[in-house]
């Protein structure tokens, strides 16, 4: 039954979708962004305890014009899942509870077998999500590759398929800046560089504050970070534009310390107006 | 990648009233942006190592507008926008490190002073 007139069950199981997702809620998943190659997902290692793998399996005729050629019932239809060391099987979810397959894993949760139906009927389509624990991912992990193989005792040649994601460590740093004040004014008379003794001789004062915040782990484990400010010190013809008087980093060194930045500002050694600090 | 400078929004903060400007308002048409990314200014990059950067850091930079340059070059200009840019860079042996939103643009508007004295 369900095997056509020739009584030979020629199924056409196809894994039409295998893509990594972020888990938004218990049964809501969002596909990960894709790399430029269009086939590799991008997984940001930033505290996501699990990753979803969306799987869609169909059993449809390969040629709608010849529906009897294949697409018969797939008996003992299964999906075999081989996980890398960095991922472990945690559970299965489906948008439609009726479509949720029974999935069993081995002891170390590295192999999973999902029962898709016995049989998986002609014309059937099933979508479900494997929930995979990311606890095994380390900063050395650069790629996730899950091998997937459909299996059935019906007549069909089946080949393994891989779902891939490139792992990157996204530093949760945010940066914002402001100028104090936001508007400046110029006036008076032209004076040469040599006539400048004090910073007050130069022109209107301005202070920039650039704040960097790190929402994640300490950067010490990842490398060395630098905060850079592109300071427009001269116009295109080489005349002074913004004269840098003082550059200080607060909070990147240790309690109460003021960090040193390079190069040193105030190259004309003008007298500092202490009232401005 | 550096983001484009913030644009002045129409009908928002206007430049001071033009009645005191020594040149006619017809001449005072230009709005100039001084920005190293556009090649209209030259920049020195101050780089500050974040040695023990666990939560936050603030870079404080004090400067002075070089009055004489503006008087010589821009006294007939309606307004100038001076752009300062800042970013974070990370040096690491880890190949798959990625920074998002790691740059910011800080614009300042500059005008000829109606009071005709250098602000102190």
């Amino acid at each position: 039954q369900g095997c056509g007139e020739d009584k030979i069950c020629q199924s056409n199981l196809q894994l039409v979708r295998a893509r990594f997702c972020t888990r938004v809620s218990d049964t809501e998943f969002q596909p990960l962004p894709m790399d430029v190659d269009g086939t590799t997902a991008l997984f940001a290692l930033s505290g996501q305890p699990v990753i979803g793998l969306e799987l869609m399996v169909t059993n449809l005729p390969s040629d709608p014009a010849q529906p009897q050629a294949d697409g018969d019932d797939a008996h003992e239809a299964q999906l075999l899942v081989m996980l890398p060391d960095s991922l472990h099987y945690s559970g299965v979810r489906a948008l439609d509870p009726a479509e949720k397959p029974l999935c069993l894993s081995n002891e170390n949760a590295s192999h999973v077998e999902c029962e898709l139906g016995n049989p998986m009927k002609r014309g059937a389509q099933v979508t479900f999500y494997l929930i995979l624990s990311t606890s095994g991912i380390s900063i050395e992990t650069t790629e996730l590759e899950v091998e997937l193989l459909l299996a059935t005792i019906s007549e069909q040649e089946l080949h393994p398929v891989s779902a891939r994601a490139r792992v990157f460590i996204e530093l949760p740093l945010s940066i914002a800046g402001m100028a104090i004040p936001q508007q400046l004014f110029f006036s008076g008379v032209v004076r040469g560089e040599r006539a400048m003794q004090s910073e007050r001789d130069v022109g209107s004062k301005v202070k920039y504050e650039v704040t960097v915040s790190n929402q994640g782990q300490s950067l010490r484990t990842l490398g060395s970070a630098f905060l850079n400010i592109m300071w427009p010190h001269e116009i295109a013809n080489g005349k002074w534009l913004l004269y840098p008087m003082q550059v200080e980093l607060e909070g990147g060194q240790g309690p109460g310390q003021k960090g040193l930045c390079s190069p040193r500002p105030n190259i004309l050694h003008l007298d500092v107006d202490s009232r401005d600090r | 990648e550096l983001e484009p400078p913030e644009q002045q929004e129409p009908g928002e903060r206007q430049e001071p009233s033009m009645s005191w400007w020594p040149v006619s308002s017809a001449e005072k048409k230009k709005n100039i942006t001084l920005d190293c990314a556009r090649g209209t200014a030259n920049c020195v990059v101050f780089s500050c190592p974040l040695y023990s950067f666990d939560r936050a850091a603030v870079l404080h930079v004090w400067g002075r507008l070089w009055n004489s340059t503006f008087l010589e070059e821009y006294s007939a200009v309606k307004s100038l926008e001076v752009i300062v840019r800042a970013n974070i860079t990370v040096k690491s042996s880890i190949k798959n490190l990625m920074l998002r939103d790691a740059s910011t643009v800080i614009p300042v508007m500059v005008y000829l002073d109606p009071m005709a004295v250098v602000a102190e």
């Epitope: 914002a176 800046g177 402001m178 104090i180 004040p181 936001q182 508007q183 400046l184 004014f185 004062k205 202070k207 704040t211 915040s213 929402q215 200080e248 607060e250 909070g251 309690p255 109460g256 003021k258 009232r275 401005d276 | 929004e9 928002e12 903060r13 001071p16 939560r55 936050a56 850091a57 603030v58 404080h60 910011t104 602000a119």
Partner: antibody
């Protein structure tokens, strides 16, 4: 939920001292410049003091003449205001407020704590 | 020290447009921020920077600036907008913050 909660207010005699606290939660406290602002009964808002992220830059309203000291403990997510030589005119609701990174604006305020200076 | 001057009181008919102004020398250099305060409550930021609204603030609130005057405009005032409004900016030293005296907005009708 991002919030600031002030405490430590109360009734104090002229010349006395009081220490106000502000407990921050729901955000990375050590990333923000913090401020105290006060409001006398029936009057307007008056800025009191500000402190930068690790306390290197501290400013006070001129009218306070060294009687108040602002401090912070980032490990405890707390802001403090030590008020000495209190006067009747210091009677006010004292608010702590967080300053936005990219603008001179106080985007999060506490509910305030009342300080009454009276004999 | 700089001062910011506001009208003590302003009234507007329900659904009409009202403008609250703030004057001060420091506003030539600094953008004003605007706060709404209802009786017995803490102030709430409504406008900051050029004309930025924090999330949750209705778009009937807008800000603008010209010369030494900053303005807060409420287009189509609602009964719930009745409150005290304060402007603030840095003072000319750049290190201190100064508040305006406040404007009591009454919504009529």
């Amino acid at each position: 939920e991002v919030q600031l909660v002030e405490s430590g207010g109360g009734l104090v005699k002229p010349g006395g001292s009081l220490r106000l606290s502000c407990a921050a939660s729901g955000f990375t406290f050590s990333s923000y410049t913090m401020n105290w602002v006060r409001q006398a009964p029936g009057k307007g808002l008056e800025w009191v003091s500000s402190i930068s992220i690790v306390g290197n830059y501290i400013y006070y309203a001129d009218s306070l003449k060294g009687r108040f000291t602002i401090s912070r403990d980032n490990a405890k997510n707390s802001l403090y205001l030590q008020m000495n030589s209190l006067r009747a005119e210091d009677t006010a609701v004292y608010y702590c407020a967080r300053r936005k990174w990219e603008h001179d604006a106080f985007d999060i305020w506490g509910q305030g704590t009342m300080v009454t200076v009276s004999s | 020290s700089s001062e910011l001057t506001q009208d003590p009181a302003v009234s507007v008919a329900l659904g009409q447009t009202v403008r609250i102004t703030c004057q001060g020398d420091s506003l030539r250099s600094y953008y004003a921020s605007w706060y709404q305060q209802k009786p017995g409550q803490a102030p709430v930021l409504v406008i900051y920077g050029k004309n930025n609204r924090p999330s949750g603030i209705p778009d009937r609130f807008s800000g603008s600036s010209s010369g030494n005057t900053a303005s807060l405009t409420i287009t189509g005032a609602q009964a719930e907008d009745e409150a005290d409004f304060y402007c603030t900016s840095r003072d000319n030293s750049g290190n201190h913050v100064v508040f305006g005296g406040g404007t009591k907005l009454t919504v009529l009708g």
